[in-house]
Interface confidence: low
C-alpha cells in the first residue's frame, strides 16, 4: 500500500489511523527534505490534490482538516514544493479507514449438519463496521470446564473430534476492531440436540388417474438419523398462502406423500426436515413444480419441462423437475 | 484418500449391454449420492443422473430414462452404471462423481477417472 | 432446464496472463455453481464450489465471482499446468447442467 513508500518526512493522523466514521480528523505532513525549505506543502487524497481546508502550521509542516469524514477507506499522501526542484517531492503517504466499532454479536447458533463432521456457528455481527473486525468463538465444556477459541472474520467450523469434553458446552462471540470490543450471550448447547439431518430432496410427482386423481410426491433423504419429522408445503403458483403437511418419516426408503390437487393447476412444493423434538430444521428444499392433468382422460407424461403424449395409461402427469433453488423458500 | 476408481474401457457391438462399475474407497459409501455424467467424443459434459447410495433411488435425466440404470453394490462400496442395447450414439467416456454439502448442494466434488465405451463395427 | 452459457469456447493466453471465463444461468441458481478443470488425460478435478468457495489444494491463482446471473471464474496468472478444458456445473435444479466448456490453449 502507500505506507510501503520511502518517506522524506512524515504523515500522521489525529485522532488516530482509524477512527470512527463521521469524526472530524486532522492530517499532519512535515517534510524532512534534504536541501529544501518547502514553499507549499500539498496533499493528495487517493491520487486527487486537496485544495481546501490546508493550514500551513510552520516551515515544514501542514495540517489537512476534514469535517464529518465519512469515507471507509482512502490513501493519503503529501508532497512538497522545493526551491530548483521541477516536480513536486514526496514526502509520506498513510492508508486511513473510518468505520464503527462492533456492535454486540447476538442470535448466536451452532449446529451439527449431518456428515459434516463439523460444529457450524453463526451469529449475526449487527451493522456493517467497515473496518477489519475479527470474531473469537468461544466453546466451554460444561462438563470439563475445557474451553476452546476460534478466530474468524465471519462464521466458524469447529470439527466435532475436537469436542471432547461431553455433550455439554457455553458457546459465546467476541467482536473486536480497532474501535472497540463487544461480547455475545452466551448460549448453551447440548451436541445430541443440534444435529440437522442431511438434505430432503423432492425427485418426482406423478397425478393418477382414478375416480378422484390423486397426485403422489417421491421424496428422499440420505438420512441415517432414524427419527426424522418433515414438513412439506405446497401452494399453486398463483396463490400466496401455503398449505402444510407434517410427517413423521422413516428414510429408509423413497418416501411416498399423497395430495389431492385441483385439476389443470401448476403447484410448487418444497420439504425441510429435523430431527424429531429438536429445536433446528434443515432450509426449505429447492422448489418442485407439478401441473396436474386436465381431468378429460387426455394423459400427459411430464418430466423436466418436457411434454410427450401417451394413449391408455394411469398414470396422468409426471413431473421430474426442479426449476430454482432458493433455500430461503421467498416466493408467490 | 478418496478416490472413485472406474473399471476399463469396453468396446460393444449395437445391441449388446455393457455395465461400468465405479469403486469407491476413502469414505463412507453411503453418505453421498453418486452422479453419472457422459462425455461424447470430442463433446462437453453432460449430467445423467444420480443414485441415492444410502436407500439406491435412481434419478435420471430425461436424455437417459429407459435404456440406462443405476445399482449399487454397498457392502463392496460400488455403484455400476448398465446401458442396455447399446447404440452408436452411446460412445462416449462416462464418468462417476461423488456428490456432496448437505444439506447444501455443492454439486460434485470428486470425480472417477472415466470410462470408455466404444461401439465396433 | 437451466441453460448454462459458457464463453469464450476457446482460448489462447500466454503464461503469467490473467484470464476469465463466464457462464450465464438462464434461470436463478442463487450461487449454486462450481467450476471444474479438465485435463489433457481426461481427468477432471473441482476447483470452486458455490461460485466462489475454493477446493482445499486449489492454487490461490484461482477465484470465482457472481454478479447477477453471470458467473466468473479467474486466473490471475497462468501457469503450464493450467491449460486445459473448464467446465461450469449449475446444481440448484435437476437436471443438473454443464457449460458447454472452455478449451484454454497456450499461445
Known amino acids: 500500500g502507500i505506507t510501503n513508500i520511502n518517506c522524506s518526512g512524515h504523515i500522521w493522523v489525529e485522532p488516530a489511523t482509524i477512527f470512527k466514521m463521521g469524526m472530524n480528523i486532522s492530517i499532519y505532513c512535515q517534510a524532512a527534505i534534504k536541501n529544501c525549505q518547502p514553499r507549499k506543502l500539498h496533499f493528495y487524497k487517493n491520487g486527487i490534490k486537496e485544495r481546501f481546508q490546508i493550514t500551513r502550521i510552520n516551515k515544514t509542516t501542514a495540517r489537512l482538516w476534514y469535517k464529518n469524514f465519512l469515507e471507509p477507506h482512502a490513501s493519503m499522501y503529501c508532497t512538497a514544493e522545493c526551491p530548483k526542484h521541477f516536480q513536486e517531492t514526496l514526502i509520506c503517504g498513510k492508508d486511513i479507514s473510518s468505520g464503527y466499532p462492533p456492535d454486540i454479536p447476538d442470535e448466536v447458533t451452532c449446529v451439527i449438519y449431518e456428515y459434516s463432521g463439523n460444529m457450524t456457528c453463526t451469529w449475526n455481527a449487527g451493522k456493517l463496521t467497515y473496518i477489519d473486525t475479527k470474531y473469537v468463538v468461544h466453546v466451554k465444556s460444561l462438563e470439563t470446564e475445557e474451553e476452546q477459541q476460534y478466530l474468524t472474520s465471519s462464521y466458524i467450523n469447529i470439527s466435532t473430534d475436537s469436542l471432547q469434553g461431553g455433550k455439554k458446552y457455553l458457546v459465546w462471540v467476541q467482536a473486536a476492531n480497532a474501535l472497540g470490543m463487544e461480547e455475545s450471550k452466551q448460549l448453551q448447547i447440548h451436541l445430541d440436540d443440534i444435529v440437522i439431518p442431511s438434505a430432503a430432496v423432492i425427485s418426482r410427482a406423478e397425478t393418477i388417474n382414478a375416480t378422484v386423481p390423486k397426485t403422489i410426491i417421491y421424496w428422499d433423504s440420505q438420512t441415517t438419523i432414524e427419527k426424522v419429522s418433515c414438513e412439506m408445503r405446497y401452494k399453486a403458483t398463483t396463490n400466496q398462502t401455503w398449505n402444510v403437511k407434517e410427517f413423521d418419516t422413516n428414510f429408509t426408503y423413497v418416501q411416498q406423500s399423497e395430495f389431492y390437487l385441483e385439476p389443470n393447476i401448476k403447484y410448487v412444493f418444497q420439504v425441510r426436515c429435523q430431527e424429531t423434538g429438536k429445536r433446528y430444521w434443515q432450509p426449505w428444499s429447492s422448489l418442485f413444480f407439478h401441473k396436474t392433468p386436465e381431468t378429460v382422460p387426455q394423459v400427459t407424461s411430464k418430466a423436466f419441462q418436457h411434454d410427450t403424449w401417451n394413449s391408455g395409461l394411469t398414470v396422468a402427469s409426471i413431473s421430474t423437475g426442479h426449476l430454482t433453488s432458493d433455500n430461503r423458500g421467498d416466493i408467490g | 484418500q478418496i478416490q472413485l476408481v472406474q473399471s476399463g474401457p469396453e468396446l460393444k457391438k449395437p445391441g449388446e449391454t455393457v455395465k461400468i462399475s465405479c469403486k469407491a474407497s476413502?469414505?463412507?459409501?453411503?453418505?453421498?449420492?453418486m452422479n453419472w455424467v457422459k462425455q461424447a467424443p470430442g463433446k462437453g459434459l453432460k449430467w445423467m443422473g444420480w443414485?441415492?447410495?444410502?436407500?439406491?433411488?435412481?434419478t435420471y435425466a430425461d436424455d437417459f430414462k429407459g435404456r440406462f440404470a443405476f445399482s449399487l453394490e454397498t457392502s463392496a462400496s460400488t455403484a455400476y452404471l448398465q446401458i442396455n442395447n447399446f447404440k452408436n450414439e452411446d460412445t462416449a467416456t462416462y464418468f462417476c462423481a461423488r456428490g456432496n454439502g448437505y444439506p447444501y448442494y455443492y454439486g460434485i466434488n470428486y470425480w472417477g477417472q472415466g470410462t470408455s465405451v466404444t461401439v465396433s463395427s | 432446464d437451466v441453460q448454462m452459457i459458457q464463453s469464450p469456447s476457446s482460448l489462447s493466453a500466454s503464461l503469467g496472463e490473467r484470464v476469465s471465463l463466464t457462464c450465464r444461468a438462464s434461470?436463478?441458481?442463487?450461487?449454486?455453481l462450481s467450476w471444474l478443470q479438465q485435463k489433457p488425460d481426461g481427468t477432471i478435478k473441482r476447483l470452486i464450489y458455490?461460485?466462489?468457495t475454493l477446493d482445499s489444494g486449489v492454487p490461490k491463482r484461482f477465484s470465482g465471482s457472481r454478479s447477477g446471473s453471470d458467473y466468473s471464474l479467474t486466473i490471475s496468472s497462468l501457469e503450464s499446468e493450467d491449460f486445459a478444458d473448464y467446465y461450469c456445473l449449475q446444481y440448484a435444479s435437476y437436471p443438473w447442467t454443464f457449460g458447454a466448456g472452455t478449451r484454454l490453449e497456450i499461445k
Open positions: 476413502g469414505y463412507t459409501f453411503t453418505n453421498y449420492g
Open positions: 443414485i441415492n447410495t444410502y436407500t439406491g433411488a435412481p
Open positions: 434461470q436463478e441458481i442463487s450461487g449454486n
Open positions: 458455490a461460485a466462489s
